[in-house]
Interface confidence: low
């Protein structure tokens, strides 16, 4: 070709028109072009319709082209990667109809100040979205709803002050979230949902440590090994986790995960609070963490949580990482989950000291509770493995343009193994949530003293109680299947659906599962 460099690599016909001072698409490019580099030209405006003759085009690099407008017309049915980074776009073009097969979209280092609600509509195949280095202040709540396959999301280096509570809803494949270097001061309750997020970058934000931060604090404690500091040019797999990088802006860079939360309302105080925010005091004994006697009081009204972390009993696991396939009530962080009217919990539940030991992760899913009183472990067929298979190899491709088919700018340099931060010894009370409409209480409000019996096998770990009786004889158990500082989660099951599925979860009583 007279202007561009053409090369054939395997089945790919790659055309490199980088840095040719082009103001438009050069004529007469090979019709079977699969990869087209147009980086560092002076295109200013560009119409995707001009590429319609290139029906095999799978990768298009338009980075550093001084683009102020991208016209989206026609259809490029197999285009999978579009790099628009380092341009001057002030609005994100609606690409869904034009690029139905898009899997990687890089719009980093543009001038985006906002995104419309339907910005990603039609991009159902999208796996990687890079919006780093723009000027975004807020995001529309349902922004990512059209992209359920999303694996990597970079919102780093923007001006974000807040995040919509349900932003990550339904993103079961998300493995890398980059939120560093924004203006975030809190994380809404339930923001992370219940699925595992192996790589989170949250540093460089002015986190405001007050009672509103307790949900985030607990999430950090539970996911300490998954919180990293971004280092340019270093592959996330080679980075060392650093939960202490997430620091309170209002208290001399104190790590958020250690924030004591003194003076914040706790469960049992006046008002309704989210279960996830209350945890027992913990004291450490070498390799173990003891959860001291915990009293959890539930109010005499239907308990509402704006994020639904009530586990289906059949999916509750003792592994510190939550399964990615969970009860439907966990999938929406916006919808509120209210106990059905026929069950109004009003009891005190005591859990005597249970000691958890940190040992290697169980990679097997939890098993459903059998219907007999003697539980027999059996794999749950519909559940995915706890360990995330995807290891992000492209954490932040926007740091540099990516004109060739090689992976854009991840890197790997040996780094020490992640160290587990010591758990905090303070309770984690939470602010009260909006109270739901009170419902009449049931006639009896029993106090149930439970020390959960357990059946532990190498492949599955779960707790079950066979009948609602006081079990005081087993006051201390060592459970060897946990790998992290233990997480004690009050798990109440009040959903009609799950009580249909499990005879032991009768709505007249409730079980506490330490997780």
């Amino acid at each position: 070709h007279p202007i561009c460099e053409v090369s054939k690599v395997a089945s790919h016909l790659e055309v490199n028109c980088d840095k040719r001072n082009l103001t438009a698409l050069p004529p007469d490019l090979p019709k079977d072009t699969t990869i087209l580099h147009l980086s560092e030209n002076l295109l200013y405006t560009f119409s995707l319709a001009t590429l319609m003759p290139y029906t095999r085009l799978t990768q298009l690099n338009l980075d550093r082209c001084e683009l102020t407008k991208l016209q989206v017309d026609g259809t490029l049915p197999v285009l999978g990667t579009l790099d628009l980074s380092h341009n001057q776009l002030q609005s994100l073009p609606l690409l869904g109809q034009t690029l139905p097969a898009l899997t990687v979209l890089d719009v980093s280092f543009n001038r985006l100040t906002s995104l419309p609600l339907g910005a990603l509509r039609g991009l159902g195949e999208l796996q990687e979205l890079y919006l780093k280095g723009n000027e975004l202040k807020t995001l529309p709540p349902g922004l990512l709803t059209p992209t359920p396959k999303l694996e990597k999301l970079s919102l780093a280096n923007n001006n974000l002050t807040e995040l919509p509570a349900g932003l990550l809803n339904g993103l079961e494949n998300l493995d890398t979230l980059l939120l560093q270097e924004n203006s975030l001061y809190t994380i809404p309750k339930g923001f992370f949902g219940s699925h595992l997020l192996p790589f989170a970058f949250l540093h460089g934000n002015p986190w405001l440590c007050n009672c509103e931060i307790l949900y985030f604090r607990r999430w950090l404690q539970d996911n300490a090994e998954n919180v990293y500091v971004w280092k340019q040019g270093v592959d996330v797999k080679a980075m060392t986790s650093n939960v202490a990088s997430v620091q309170c802006d209002n208290s001399d860079k104190f790590p958020v995960y250690k924030y004591p939360g003194k003076g914040c309302p706790t469960l049992g105080d006046e008002g309704d609070t989210d279960l996830y925010d209350y945890y027992p005091e913990e004291d450490t004994e070498g390799d173990k963490v003891r959860a001291t006697r915990t009293v959890v009081k539930f109010p005499t009204k239907a308990h509402t949580t704006p994020w639904g972390l009530f586990y289906s009993w059949s999916t509750a696991s003792l592994d510190s990482q939550m399964p990615s396939s969970l009860h439907p009530t966990q999938e929406s962080t916006k919808e509120q989950t209210t106990f059905p009217p026929r069950w109004t919990p009003n009891f005190t539940l005591h859990m005597e000291s249970i000691t958890f030991s940190k040992t290697p992760k169980s990679t097997t899913e939890p098993t459903p509770s059998p219907t007999t009183s003697e539980p027999v472990p059996e794999p749950a067929p519909n559940m995915t493995t706890l360990e995330p298979t995807p290891s992000p190899t492209t954490p932040e491709p926007t740091s540099e343009p990516a004109p060739s088919p090689t992976t854009p700018e991840p890197t790997s340099e040996p780094a020490p193994s992640p160290t587990t931060p010591e758990p905090t010894s303070e309770p984690a009370p939470s602010p009260t949530t909006p109270e739901p409409t009170p419902i009449p209480t049931i006639a009896t409000s029993p106090t149930i003293l439970v020390s959960a019996t357990s059946l532990i096998t190498p492949k599955s770990t779960f707790l079950t109680t066979t009948k609602p009786v006081s079990l005081l004889e087993s006051t201390k158990k060592t459970i060897p299947e946990l790998d992290q500082p233990p997480k004690l989660r009050g798990v109440l099951q009040g959903h009609l659906e799950s009580s249909r599925n499990d005879p032991f979860l009768h709505p007249d009583f409730c079980c506490l599962l330490p997780l």
Epitope: D18, K19, S39, E40, F109, G133, E135, N157, N158, N159, E181, G204, K231, Q232, G233, V234, D235, A238, E396, P397, T398, S399, E400, P401, A402, P403, S404, T406, T407, P408, E409, P410, T411, S412, E413
Partner: antibody, heavy 118, light 113 residues
Framework: QVQLVESGGGVVQPGRSLRLSCAAS????????MSWVRQAPGKGLEWVAS???????YYPDSVLGRFTISRDNSKNTLYLQMNSLRAEDTAVYYC????????????WGQGTLVTVSS | DIVMTQSPDSLAVSLGERATINCKSS????????????LAWYQQKPGQPPKLLIY???TRESGVPDRFSGSGSGTDFTLTISSLQAEDVAVYYC?????????FGGGTKLEIK
């Protein structure tokens, strides 16, 4: 540990060409942006070229059109093809690893001297 | 291009004393999005390549002694060696890593008085 070893320097006449190489080890070469920085005798540092992990090259105006940076990830080697050399290109040429778009240089080689003289 | 100007050209300081080197850029190196200044400092000893000391104005590279510190914002920056050691004799360069082409200051030669 990270090591960068330059080679290919020498004495060359003005207008001629020279190709420098930089052998990298101790890190995943293909994943890092790489650069050449030069230092004329007794002078300061001057950035010459960079190439991203994906292969996109960048140059300052002083060498644009004369120098070409390239990389062979299979050989963990960085190259600098220098054409139409001038006397003012005389310098020690350092190969440096950079962290990406931030483009400061965290590891440097020992350098190779290029002398352009008639 | 962003021009980097260092001062002084040379500096003689007694062992154990504080050394201060200044660097001025022709335009701001502050990224308003993340409030970071994109300035790095390097140390070059005779016959050796440069060594990264500090980036983002004040972040010390791993392994760099804490007697080295960086400060400043916008266009004016400072490298401080709190207590000069014999091994600190070198030429020090600032570099902006804010905008291509990446440019260096002219260098400051630090000697022992």
């Amino acid at each position: 540990q990270v090591q960068l070893v330059e080679s290919g320097g020498g004495v060359v006449q003005p207008g001629r060409s020279l190709r420098l190489s930089c052998a990298a080890s101790g890190f995943t070469f293909s994943s890092f942006a790489m650069s050449w920085v030069r230092q004329a005798p007794g002078k300061g540092l001057e950035w010459v070229a960079s190439i991203t992990s994906a292969g996109t090259p960048y140059y300052p105006d002083s060498v644009l059109g004369r120098f070409t940076i390239s990389r062979d990830n299979s050989k963990n080697t960085l190259y600098l093809q220098m054409n139409s050399l001038r006397a003012e290109d005389t310098a020690v040429y350092y190969c440096a690893r950079s962290r990406g778009y931030e483009d400061y240089f965290d590891y440097w080689g020992q350098g190779t001297l290029v002398t352009v003289s008639s | 291009d962003i021009v980097m100007t260092q001062s002084p050209d040379s500096l003689a300081v007694s062992l154990g004393e504080r050394a201060t080197i200044n660097c001025k850029s022709s335009q701001s190196l502050l990224n308003s999005r993340n409030q970071k200044n994109y300035l790095a400092w390097y140390q070059q000893k005779p016959g050796q390549p440069p060594k990264l000391l500090i980036y983002f104005t004040s972040t010390r590279e791993s392994g760099v002694p804490d007697r080295f510190s960086g400060s400043g914002s916008g266009t004016d920056f400072t490298l401080t060696i709190s207590s000069l050691q014999a091994e600190d004799v070198a030429v020090y360069y600032c570099q902006q890593h804010y905008s291509s082409p990446w440019t260096f200051g002219g260098g400051t030669k630090l000697e022992i008085k």
